[in-house]
């Protein structure tokens, strides 16, 4: 298992699987899209990241989604914030939230393969998707809370849909959602973002 | 190969104003500007991308310092207000060809001026 040592006093070291989900429209302009993907690194620093700890996915999403880490990559942690570092700005009219959630229920969470491990998506939010591209939005909500895994919606700015955020709280008490009026509160919301997605992970149990 | 060449430093009063520029000689897409204080570390300053003309500027220097670029030119512009004696530094232009590391971060980019001293004096 490939490791590094810790890069900060807070540092996760829990049974995790987290996927970060990237809002790639153009509500966000290209700067804050990089303030976002900063913010995405900057939790990954805050994890112990490796195949037996926390496992991470990161996927852009637009009226598609594209994924640029998978939970399964064996890479260094340092490569693997590198790659996040590196997601292209789409800057796309739409940014289905429905597809992308579809995409976690069946893709990235098709087979539990490490049932002991908490599952989160945390779900980066800056716009609305079209009416039409939400009818199974919910279904796909339900579908993940059946596969045990929590939503964490982070509404971002002024155009995040706070009804679809509300939709995902109502699924679950553990889909605690976080409201920011712009990226620039990402920063000083990180450590509480952190703190919450690690207390919901079990610590691994003692060496038998 | 990507060259960068700043210009419009030079020694200001506190309280003053400076423009910088940084003419680049091919395209480019982010282009930032660091600074290097005597005997401290080059710190992000600002930086503006071509896709959309969108600004990302240090919180240190935020509602003083303005970047801005002109596309026909190739050129980005540094617009320094209420200059204060801990912004003299030696002020750098870069860009990079990918996106690899966070945009502060100085490894992100692949291309830098040799830089142009700003003075602030009280």
């Known amino acids: 298992d490939i490791s590094e040592p810790p890069l900060h006093d807070f540092y996760c070291s829990r049974l995790l699987d987290l996927v970060f989900l990237l809002d790639g429209s153009s509500r966000l302009s290209e700067a804050e899209f990089e303030v976002l993907k900063a913010f995405v690194v900057d939790m990954m620093e805050r994890l112990r990241i490796s195949q037996k700890w926390v496992r991470v996915a990161v996927v852009e999403y637009h009226d598609g989604s594209h994924a640029y880490i998978g939970l399964k990559d064996r890479k260094r942690p340092s490569e693997l914030r590198r790659i996040a570092s590196q997601v292209k700005y789409a800057g796309s009219q739409v940014a289905s939230t429905s597809e992308v959630l579809k995409y976690t229920l069946f893709q990235i969470f098709s087979k539990i393969d490490r049932p002991e491990a908490s599952r989160i998506a945390l779900l980066l939010m800056a716009s609305q998707e079209p009416q039409r591209m939400s009818r199974n939005f919910v279904r796909y909500v339900q579908g993940l809370k059946k596969k045990k895994v929590i939503v964490i919606p982070v509404g971002i700015g002024p155009h995040a849909n706070l009804k679809q955020i509300r939709l995902i709280e109502k699924q679950a008490p553990e889909n605690k959602a976080f409201v920011l009026s712009s990226v620039d509160e990402l920063e000083q919301q990180r450590d509480e973002i952190v703190s919450y997605l690690c207390d919901l992970a079990p610590e691994a149990p003692p060496p038998t | 190969q990507v060259q960068l060449v700043e210009s419009g430093g030079g020694l200001v009063q506190a309280g003053g104003s400076l423009r910088l520029s940084c003419a680049a000689s091919?395209?480019?897409?982010?282009m930032a500007w660091f600074r290097q204080p005597p005997g401290k570390e080059r710190e992000f300053v600002a930086v503006?991308?071509?896709?959309?003309?969108?600004?990302l500027v240090a919180a240190s220097v935020k509602g003083r310092f303005t970047i801005s670029r002109d596309n026909a030119k190739n050129t980005v512009y540094l617009q320094m207000t209420s200059l204060k004696p801990a912004d003299t530094a030696v002020y750098y232009c870069?860009?990079?060809?990918?996106?690899?590391?966070?945009?502060?971060?100085?490894?992100?980019?692949?291309?830098w001026g040799q830089g142009t001293q700003v003075t602030v004096s009280s």
């Open positions: 091919g395209r480019t897409k982010d």
């Open positions: 870069a860009t990079s060809r990918g996106y690899s590391g966070t945009y502060y971060s100085t490894s992100r980019y692949d291309y």
């Open positions: 503006i991308y071509s896709s959309d003309g969108s600004t």
